[in-house]
Interface confidence: medium
């Protein structure tokens, strides 16, 4: 019979011959024959392979590096990587996070908008007129000055973006 | 200076409980997000928790919530750590941590070693 030119799905050609593919989490160790099977072996302990391959070898799981500020999310099997993610308070600085970047903590003045993730960056807003923040942040919000006039009290100093107003007691007309 | 001092470690069987205390100077403490940190033998840092500069905002790491306790006493400039239910994994020495700071960290106290053992 004519050798065939192409080969099936999971299939792969060589010597004029089809041989299987090794499966997801195994290694190509030797080709197959006209008498034998491919032979595969499973990967080894921090290694994977994940598709049907005729690799030699088998990938390293990534190293979640902590002097990085990694740290591992999901351990990798013989089939599937290592996905690392960043420690609590950072960010990745792309999406394969290879490194992983501090949460910018919001001024005085600025406001949380939105708290940081594992995969984007801390949002601040400036405080509006009303608002004040006097604290370097990564989680706090704006706050609203107190209102002197539910404490029965009026402005004694103005608030700012930074500050609370201060609130003192009302002047007194004598009789 | 920022100086961190943190105090309240010793040896405690499992199932015990420790407060751990963290005295902060050379710095204006309740304006800045604080969090602790440890290290067990032979093994890399593991962040443990993060309070926000009020208060209001804490995070635990899944190893410990529900067991430990992250507060703060912005008039005493002092962080605490409540542990309770220690279990033989605790054991470490822990570091509290002016937050935001550079990885790897450039500042530490001298830390409080925690043991947990029967």
């Known amino acids: 019979p004519e050798p065939p030119t192409a080969c099936r799905e999971k299939q792969y050609l060589i010597n004029s011959q089809c041989c299987s593919l090794c499966q997801p989490g195994q290694k190509l160790v030797s080709d197959c024959t006209e008498f034998t099977e491919t032979e595969c072996l499973p990967c080894g302990e921090s290694e994977f392979l994940d598709t049907w391959n005729r690799e030699t070898h088998c990938h390293q799981h990534k190293y979640c590096d902590p002097n990085l500020g990694l740290r591992v999310q999901q351990k990798g099997t013989s089939e599937t990587d290592t996905i690392c993610t960043c420690e609590e308070g950072w960010h990745c600085t792309s999406e394969a996070c290879e490194s992983c970047v501090l949460h910018r903590s919001c001024s005085p003045g600025f406001g949380v908008k939105q708290i940081a993730t594992g995969v984007s960056d801390t949002i601040c807003e400036p405080c509006p007129v009303g608002f004040f923040s006097n604290v370097s942040s990564a989680f706090e919000k704006c706050h609203p000055w107190t209102s002197c006039e539910t404490k029965d009290l009026v402005v004694q100093q103005a608030g700012t973006n930074k500050t609370d107003v201060v609130c003192g007691p009302q002047d007194r007309l004598r009789a | 200076e920022v100086q961190l001092l943190e105090s309240g470690g010793g040896l405690v069987q499992p199932g015990g409980s420790l407060r751990l205390s963290c005295a902060a100077s050379?710095?204006?403490?309740?304006?800045?997000?604080m969090k602790w940190v440890r290290q067990a033998p032979g093994k890399g840092l593991e962040w443990v928790s993060t309070?926000?500069?009020?208060?209001?905002?804490?995070y635990y790491a899944d190893s410990v919530k529900g067991r430990f306790t992250i507060s703060r006493d912005n008039s005493k400039n002092t962080l605490y750590l409540q542990m309770n239910s220690l279990r033989a994994e605790d054991t470490a020495v822990y570091y509290c941590?002016?937050?935001?700071?550079?990885?790897?960290?450039?500042?530490w106290g001298q830390g409080t070693l925690v043991t947990v053992s029967s």
């Open positions: 309070i926000s500069s009020s208060g209001t905002h804490t």
């Open positions: 050379g710095f204006t403490f309740g304006i800045y997000d």
């Open positions: 941590a002016k937050y935001p700071q550079p990885y790897p960290f450039d500042y």
